[in-house]
């Protein structure tokens, strides 16, 4: 016979998995925050930038109120998923003018691969269904200049921010319906 | 040594509007994230503005948000915080202070402050 | 907006004893991002810890910080006079940028 069976695994409080989950959020976003306002200070650009690649923004603040846990976190993976393309995009094909943010873009993505594992590992604790694997999405055309560069930059980093600052949010809320 | 001179303080009517300068020295100017920090006569510190080095990105605190200008003169190492439409809860002792080396690290060095007061 | 309550209000110690300083933050808050002051009466603050525990530059070894999530402490080991002052927390995770209302150190 084999060895005597251990102590039931006890599965972790799915709160203290959320709490990790809204720092490393939070975290991400204070990065994400600060790294666009160092882009801007060495590019300054005026205006709104947008990059049609990009995933729409999750929800309003105000629609907070209407969201349920297993969307909220299936929605926040898909759209971290495609920040997390588009940012290996920026570092790959952004051009001489990035690379002097080359290590705060390569935190930023280590750092966004965490949370979408740590998303991961919340959803299987939570036992909510796995999404289906992502279809392989359109590669992502290189910025036509330099300027180009910056610009996807700033959108990206602009998106993120807002995405994130949704997530913290609505992850805080859903925590009080656990 | 890092030093942050504040000047421009003073008595002021409501409604009216102060200039308050920051002289820095001993450090890089232009390589600092810089920021207005307040206190009440008797009461704790409340945050007011920041501005990146480069001054493209700032923030206000709600309290001071379309009233209060956050500025920075890189070539003569000078901060300012232009204070329109000045109220009675203004009033406090205003420090200019530098962050450390990176954002997350706290306010690591101050002025000794410039005391506006704001009564009629 | 991110508040920070400290507590106690007031403390009453005497030289030599260890003072207990706490900071209970309204949001979970990574431990990075809390930062703790000392200020006397008409002089400007002075940051002594920042990322939570980390001793800022000439601050004596008395002085150490723990804590994550949404409780931080500042501990003084064995309180030397100068160390009668009032203390802040503070984050700078989110902005606006706060403070806790400040824990006066009193000498009993």
């Known amino acids: 016979p084999g060895p005597p069976p251990g102590p039931p695994r006890v599965s972790p409080d799915p709160r203290a998995e959320l709490d990790s989950t809204v720092l490393l959020t939070r975290s991400l976003l204070a990065d994400t925050r600060q790294l666009a306002a160092q882009l801007r200070d060495k590019f300054p650009a005026d205006g709104d930038h947008n990059l049609d690649s990009l995933p729409t923004l999750a929800m309003s603040a105000g629609a907070l109120g209407a969201l349920q846990l297993p969307g909220v976190l299936t929605r926040l993976r898909a759209d971290l998923l495609s920040y997390l393309r588009h940012v290996q995009w920026l570092r790959r094909a952004g051009g001489s003018s990035l690379k002097t943010l080359e290590p705060e873009l390569g935190t930023l993505q280590a750092r966004l691969d965490r949370l979408l594992r740590r998303l991961q590992l919340l959803m299987s604790r939570l036992a909510l269904p796995q999404p289906p694997p992502d279809p392989p999405a359109p590669p992502l055309a290189p910025p036509s200049s330099a300027w180009g560069g910056i610009r996807a930059a700033l959108a990206i980093l602009g998106g993120l921010h807002l995405t994130l600052d949704w997530a913290v949010r609505g992850l805080l809320l859903l925590k009080t319906r656990l | 040594e890092v030093q942050l001179v504040e000047s421009g303080g003073g008595l002021v009517q409501p409604g009216g509007s102060l200039r308050l300068s920051c002289a820095a020295s001993?450090?890089?100017?232009?390589?600092?994230?810089m920021h207005w920090v307040r206190q009440a006569p008797g009461k704790g510190l409340e945050w007011v503005a920041y501005?990146?080095?480069?001054?493209?990105?700032?923030y206000y605190a709600d309290t001071v948000k379309g009233r209060f200008t956050i500025s920075r003169d890189n070539a003569k190492n000078s901060l300012y915080l232009q204070m329109n439409s000045l109220r009675a809860e203004d009033t406090a002792v205003y420090y200019c202070?530098?962050?450390?080396?990176?954002?997350?690290?706290?306010?690591?060095?101050w002025g000794q402050g410039t005391l506006v007061t704001v009564s009629s | 907006e991110i508040v920070l309550t400290q507590s106690p209000a007031t403390l009453s110690l005497s030289p030599g004893e260890r003072a207990t300083l706490s900071c209970s933050v309204s949001d979970l808050i990574p431990s990075q991002y809390l930062s703790w002051y000392q200020q006397k009466p008409g002089q400007a603050p002075r940051l002594l810890i920042y990322?939570?525990?980390n001793l800022a530059s000439g601050i004596p070894a008395r002085f150490s910080g723990s804590g994550s999530g949404t409780d931080f402490t500042l501990t003084i080991s064995s309180l030397e006079p100068e160390d009668f002052a009032v203390y802040y927390c503070q984050q700078g995770v989110d902005v606006p940028f706060t403070f806790g209302q400040g824990t006066k150190l009193e000498i009993k």
């Open positions: 501005i990146t080095p480069g001054s493209n990105t700032i």
């Open positions: 202070a530098r962050e450390y080396y990176s954002y997350d690290e706290g306010f690591a060095y």
């Open positions: 990322r939570t525990s």
């Open positions: 001993g450090f890089t100017f232009s390589s600092f994230g």
